[in-house]
């Protein structure tokens, strides 16, 4: 009976025309959904003048419906048993599941200045910036809709900038209209045991963005794992998101909608500083705002981010050390609702449910040249938005499951 | 490759004049902005004169403004640096750089320098 299941499973499980899993990797069957909360600055003209606290308040959920566009360029190589695609971007609000519009105004860190500030470094320029910055009217902070801030706006200053600069920014430009990837996986025909695992990504077995083996990317994109899952295992994971690959482990045994499930979940040795966690040391690439790499809870992203200064958390510095949120007040961390955590349907390593859960923040210093910056005293690692991803395996598909899966090992 | 390469330094009396050129070579002169800096032992590089691409903004440090004059010109991939009333000072390491601005990146380049001496 059991080698029968197994026999089938590793048959259904391959990404190849035909399988159970193929249809629902296309094309995910699961509504996913994006939410986001935007950390309101309360105090902004403080902050600016007297390099106070920042006081922060969250405003949301903002929802968007997200991954609902099949994979493209879905291209088999019967050669080395993989598939390669891409992964098209879309996001649709969902109004009815959001506290307001997208044109609801947030006072947010000015995105442009303090990008600008931290990569922009020489002295003429930073001259050159500074009268942009006043002339243009642009300060330490600024008002936006959750729509600019999110997709995209031309920022005054930038456009006056006399060279070929960039001059749209958003937390998430450009988004519409664009595509993660190329993945090429492992398709299991071989091998069931690689099934889903990327072999590269961008053409490339390593990131570029980190040292050692920090660089590399590890296991599937946390959609399936390879079957026949182990409470014992760590699974690995790569996501594009925070440019890394990272692993969650077995933390409860859980029912949903019937179906047994191991949800694992990201630890807080993950986000561990190399002190305590001495595997973490290639993620720490600088020394003065990691204070000699002791701080911990914050990845810097720059490299992967055009050399932004985009630092990445979990929501309201979950895990996070004390000097990084100590100069931010309003944030209340707690697990339940701040960490990430993945459903796993044992059997066929299927993610019937997941929430995933990060924080975007952008790290703004004292600058001699630049006015709205002359009075800080500190660096501000300064939370802009958190978001969690979720998505649920749907009412029929879980009858199903349960009917051809868990009902027939039972 | 980008070179940038000064010349002109030399040793002068109070009051005289000098005249710095630095040529570059390898990118697009026209499209960075040109600078000379200056260093003296133990201290920073401080931004003495600056221009932008052609028909930009230029700026002078306030010690050495209505005496010295920076210039150039792309058709000979040239910067320069003209200083009158010289004053013991001006005694540096004369440094000249290019930058310019491209998506969300900075190319900043710099020539070896040339000594200016101003001693009576």
């Known amino acids: 009976g059991d080698l029968l299941i197994q026999k089938t499973i590793k048959k259904q499980v391959v990404l190849e025309e035909g399988t159970i899993a193929f249809k629902n990797w296309v094309k995910t069957g699961t509504e996913v959904y994006r939410q986001f909360w935007i950390f309101d600055v309360q105090n902004p003209q403080e902050v600016m003048m007297n390099s106070s606290n920042i006081q922060v308040k969250q405003r949301g959920p903002y929802t968007y419906r997200v991954r609902f566009l099949a994979k493209e360029n879905v291209t088999q190589d019967a050669e080395d048993n993989t598939v390669s695609f891409l992964q098209p971007n879309g996001a649709i609000f969902e109004p009815s599941l959001s506290v307001g519009t997208e044109a609801d105004n947030f006072t947010v860190l000015n995105l442009a200045v303090a990008a600008a500030s931290h990569i922009y470094q020489n002295q003429f320029v930073q001259m050159i910036l500074n009268s942009l910055i006043n002339k243009s009217k642009s300060s330490m902070f600024q008002v936006r809709t959750l729509r600019e801030l999110l997709w995209g706006y031309r920022d005054p200053f930038l456009s006056l900038v006399p060279y070929p600069v960039t001059t749209t920014v958003g937390l998430f430009y450009p988004y519409n209209n664009t595509a993660d990837g190329v993945y090429k996986v492992f398709n299991g025909k071989d091998n069931i045991s690689k099934v889903a695992i990327i072999d590269t990504y961008k053409g490339k077995r390593n990131l570029s963005y980190w040292e050692s083996h920090c660089d590399m990317i590890n296991g599937t994109d946390a959609a399936s794992f390879p079957p026949f899952v182990e409470k014992s295992q760590v699974l690995q994971f790569f996501s594009s998101d925070i440019c890394r690959s990272i692993y969650a482990v077995f933390e409860s045994d859980v029912n949903l909608k019937g179906i047994p499930v191991y949800r694992f979940v990201l630890p807080s040795k993950a986000f561990a500083s190399p002190v305590e966690n001495p595997d973490n040391y290639c993620f720490c690439t600088e020394k003065i705002i990691s204070k000699n790499c002791t701080s911990y809870g914050v990845l810097d992203i720059s490299k992967c981010k055009e050399g932004r200064p985009v630092y990445i958390s979990l929501p309201h510095f979950l895990y996070a050390s004390p000097d990084v949120s100590e100069p931010i007040d309003g944030l209340n961390p707690n697990e339940e609702e701040h960490r990430t955590y993945l459903d796993i349907e044992p059997i066929t390593g299927f993610t019937l449910q997941f929430a995933k859960r990060l924080q975007v923040n952008l790290l703004v210093k004292p600058s001699e040249k630049i006015q709205v910056l002359k009075n800080l005293k500190r660096n501000y690692i300064v939370p802009i938005l958190w978001l969690n991803e979720t998505g649920t395996i749907g009412d029929e598909k879980a009858n199903m499951f349960r009917s051809q899966v868990t009902g027939k090992i039972n | 490759q980008v070179q940038l390469q000064e010349s002109g330094g030399g040793l002068v009396q109070p009051g005289e004049s000098l005249r710095l050129s630095c040529a570059a070579s390898?990118?697009?002169?026209?499209?960075?902005?040109m600078s000379w800096y200056r260093q003296t032992p133990g201290k920073e590089r401080e931004l003495v004169a600056a221009?932008?691409?052609?028909?930009?903004?230029?700026y002078y440090a306030d010690s050495v403004k209505g005496r010295f004059t920076i210039s150039r010109d792309d058709a000979k991939n040239t910067v320069y640096l003209q200083m009158n009333s010289l004053k013991p000072e001006d005694t540096a390491v004369y440094y000249c750089?290019?930058?310019?601005?491209?998506?969300?990146?900075?190319?900043?380049?710099w020539g070896q320098g040339t000594q200016v001496t101003v001693s009576s």
């Open positions: 221009m932008q691409s052609t028909g930009g903004t230029t």
């Open positions: 390898g990118f697009t002169f026209s499209n960075y902005a």
């Open positions: 750089n290019a930058v310019t601005l491209q998506g969300w990146s900075e190319y900043d380049y």
